[in-house]
């Protein structure tokens, strides 16, 4: 389990010809909000899938009223992160769909009207626990700048949030802010605990007890909007509403490792690899002899009888580093087949197999596809305790006998064409119609009464889902 987080930094007119001055129509003021949709996988053939990893809707942004003489600005945005919780494993590869909606606040029959301003679809690879990824995307004449990351929520850890970790009370040699894990992984996991009261929305920490602010926020707990900001080179002024850009300096900036140690970033923190003769979180401890017991995890110390002669640690299987302080992640080689869960016990690896599989590496299949038929070009896949069919695109159900085309129900009215795009169904309306399902006739004056709920678009706009 974990959370996908999206931070919108700016939304405004893009460069180049045809850049709009205002997101609002001539009918008066409007405000923006965003919708994010996550789908697993990168495949173009995943057209039918809903937002299987989850979706989220932002709060409404501040009201925007166009100033006729003013330059086209970055638009006022909703505060805070968009967070999409996911229950299962983080897939690593995913499609990210961000929609920018406007809510028109002028005199509307039946209340406010919503319409889709822009939509970007990104297919990405991302490991959970990694740093913020930044992106700039154009959608038509608009430009959207945003950052995103996926993070696990305890007890889940790892790049896919599939390994389980629970705190133990026994003392350990884990560094400050890190806790040992149980049941079987004897390793130090978990993100640092930030200073008490540090803003969840506008603050973050890379060391335990600190509170660092996202650009655009200040104060000891990152609760005070900053009046001005450089926005790390982003176009336009910063404002308290934009949240601006994400953490600037990385944890290894300025190399926190002393005495020639080399720094590598880890999720939410850093790790120093120390030269011989030094150890500690930042390689700050020197003058160490074997008598000081510098070799962790049962490592054997050789030499180093006095402070001037270097010692050498001979590490037991499963550990490495100049002080045997690092666990070798033997599970990263994915030795368990057929979706088995890898457990590194230190002295050995163990695979916990999914139902239907057995063997030291879950290599034996207990199911049998013999005599099982999958219709419409589907193929039988063994596993999960019973046979299942992997269906050809356009079919679904246990035996691939059901039509799974998102366009099968003919959702696009009045002769509109439905396309099974990887990001979801897309309607292309016949001339003279508009709306999310081409349901509204375009009036002779080129406008149509839109429903008072999303999605409704300008005439001639594609309909996107």
């Amino acid at each position: 389990a974990g959370v996908f987080e999206l931070q919108i930094h700016s939304f405004g007119p893009g460069p180049g010809p045809g850049a709009p001055r205002s997101p609002c129509s001539a009918r008066g003021p409007c405000r923006l909000f965003f919708r994010v949709c996550l789908k697993p996988g990168l495949s173009e053939e995943a057209a039918e899938s809903p937002c299987a990893l989850g979706a989220a809707l932002s709060a409404r942004g501040p009201v925007y009223t166009e100033q006729p003489e003013a330059p086209a600005p970055d638009l006022p945005l909703p505060n805070g992160l968009l967070q999409v919780p996911f229950r299962d494993a983080w897939p690593g590869t995913f499609s990210l769909i961000i929609e920018t909606w406007r809510e028109e606040l002028g005199d509307q029959i039946g209340g406010p009207a919503w319409s889709l301003l822009a939509r970007v679809t990104r297919r990405r690879r991302l490991a959970a626990g990694g740093p913020w990824a930044r992106d700039i995307q154009r959608a038509g004449a608009w430009e959207l700048r945003f950052s995103y990351r996926a993070r696990c929520e305890l007890p889940a850890v790892g790049t896919a949030c599939t390994r389980l970790c629970r705190p133990r009370s026994a003392p350990s040699r884990c560094g400050p802010g890190l806790r040992p894990c149980a049941p079987l992984e004897d390793e130090c996991e978990a993100p640092p605990v930030c200073r008490a009261g540090c803003s969840l929305e506008h603050g973050f920490c890379e060391q335990p007890g600190e509170c660092r602010c996202l650009e655009g926020w200040t104060g000891p707990l990152c609760t005070v909007p900053a009046s001005t900001s450089s926005c790390l080179g982003l176009r336009g002024p910063s404002s308290a509403t934009t949240g601006c850009l994400v953490p600037g300096p990385g944890p290894c900036d300025g190399n926190p490792c002393a005495n020639g140690g080399s720094c590598s970033e880890t999720p939410g923190s850093f790790e120093c690899t120390c030269p011989r003769g030094f150890y500690g979180l930042r390689c700050e401890v020197s003058g160490v002899t074997c008598a000081d017991g510098p070799c962790f995890n049962g490592g054997l110390c050789v030499g180093g009888a006095d402070p001037d002669s270097a010692y050498i640690c001979h590490c037991p299987p499963g550990f490495q580093g100049s002080n045997c302080e690092k666990r070798v992640d033997r599970c990263s080689l994915q030795p368990c087949r057929n979706g088995g869960l890898c457990l590194d016990l230190g002295h050995a690896l163990r695979c916990r197999c999914r139902a239907g599989f057995a063997g030291p590496r879950c290599e034996h299949n207990l199911d049998d596809c013999a005599g099982r038929a999958c219709a419409n070009g589907g193929t039988c896949v063994e596993g999960g305790g019973a046979h299942r069919c992997s269906c050809a695109l356009g079919f679904g159900g246990r035996d691939c006998r059901e039509r799974a085309d998102p366009c099968a129900a003919r959702p696009c009215a009045h002769g509109g064409r439905c396309y099974a795009h990887f990001s979801g169904l897309v309607c292309a309306c016949a001339p003279g119609y508009m709306g999310s399902r081409c349901e509204f006739p375009v009036h002779p004056d080129g406008v149509s009464a839109l429903p008072a709920a999303p999605p409704g678009l300008r005439p001639g706009d594609p309909q996107r889902h």
Epitope: A139, L393, C407, Y419, F422, A428, C429
Partner: antibody, heavy 119, light 110 residues
Framework: QVTLRESGPALVKPTQTLTLTCTFS?????????MGWVRQAPGQGLEWMGT????????DYASWAKGRVTISVDTSKNQFSLKLSSVTAADTAVYYC???????????WGQGTLVTVSS | DIQLTQSPSFLSASVGDRVTITCQST????????LSWYQQKPGQPPKLLIY???NLEIGVPSRFSGSGSGTDFTLTINSLEAEDAATYYC??????????FGGGTKVEIK
């Protein structure tokens, strides 16, 4: 593996009808696409000829192609075909089949087949 | 008939140069952004670079970018590389289920 492959005669005589076939694999026409034909004369640019929409098998053609081009589908063979009547030397080109799945772009192309019109 | 006009039709540039190709349509494309860009090398089918005016197709280097809406669009190659020598085409989709291609821009490396 999602693929398209064009096939047909490499040489056609003037005034004859050219028939080309596009065989697809890795996807099913039960989903909704535009399957299109695009041609490219030697040393020239790309030219859209027409498409067939698999949702209802309706066809659309470039204005120059109306009356000369017919596109059809044979779902049982995972094929769709192009017929171009009354060919002349100006129809000598590489002919591509391509698939559109939304937002107006052809995301999947065949390798193309060269057709020469000559007596 | 709808016309898509690309300019220039030919350009010669050095490795590392920033290259811009424009595409102008006689009619607005569907939804204002249903325009795509392709790269074609001799003997190969076109390869999709950009769709929906500005979305980079997966696997395409980030030095390629697209912008524009309605009738005016631009393809930019930020830092030209030797492998970018090819012909580039814009292609629009229009109301009434009509497609059209631009005339192409041949990019040569100096």
């Amino acid at each position: 593996q999602v693929t398209l492959r064009e096939s047909g005669p490499a040489l056609v005589k003037p005034t004859q009808t050219l028939t080309l076939t596009c065989t697809f694999s890795g996807f099913s026409l039960s989903s909704s696409y535009d399957m299109g034909w695009v041609r490219q004369a030697p040393g020239q640019g790309l030219e859209w000829m027409g498409t067939i929409y698999t949702g209802d098998y309706s066809t659309d053609y470039a204005s120059w192609a109306k009356g000369r081009v017919t596109i059809s589908v044979d779902t049982s063979k995972n094929q769709f075909s192009l017929k171009l009547s009354s060919v002349t030397a100006a129809d000598t080109a590489v002919y591509y089949c391509a698939r559109h799945t939304g937002y107006g772009y052809f995301g999947l192309w065949g390798q193309g087949t060269l057709v020469t019109v000559s007596s | 008939d709808i016309q898509l006009t690309q300019s220039p039709s030919f350009l010669s540039a050095s490795v590392g140069d920033r290259v811009t190709i424009t595409c102008q349509s006689t009619e607005s494309v569907y939804g204002s952004d249903w325009l795509s860009w392709y790269q074609q090398k001799p003997g190969q089918p076109p390869k999709l670079l950009i769709y929906q005016a500005s979305n980079l197709e997966i696997g395409v280097p980030s030095r390629f970018s697209g912008s524009g809406s309605g009738t005016d669009f631009t393809l930019t190659i930020n830092s030209l590389e030797a492998e970018d020598a090819a012909t580039y085409y814009c292609q629009g989709y229009y109301s009434g289920y009509i497609y059209a291609f631009g005339g192409g821009t041949k990019v040569e490396i100096k």
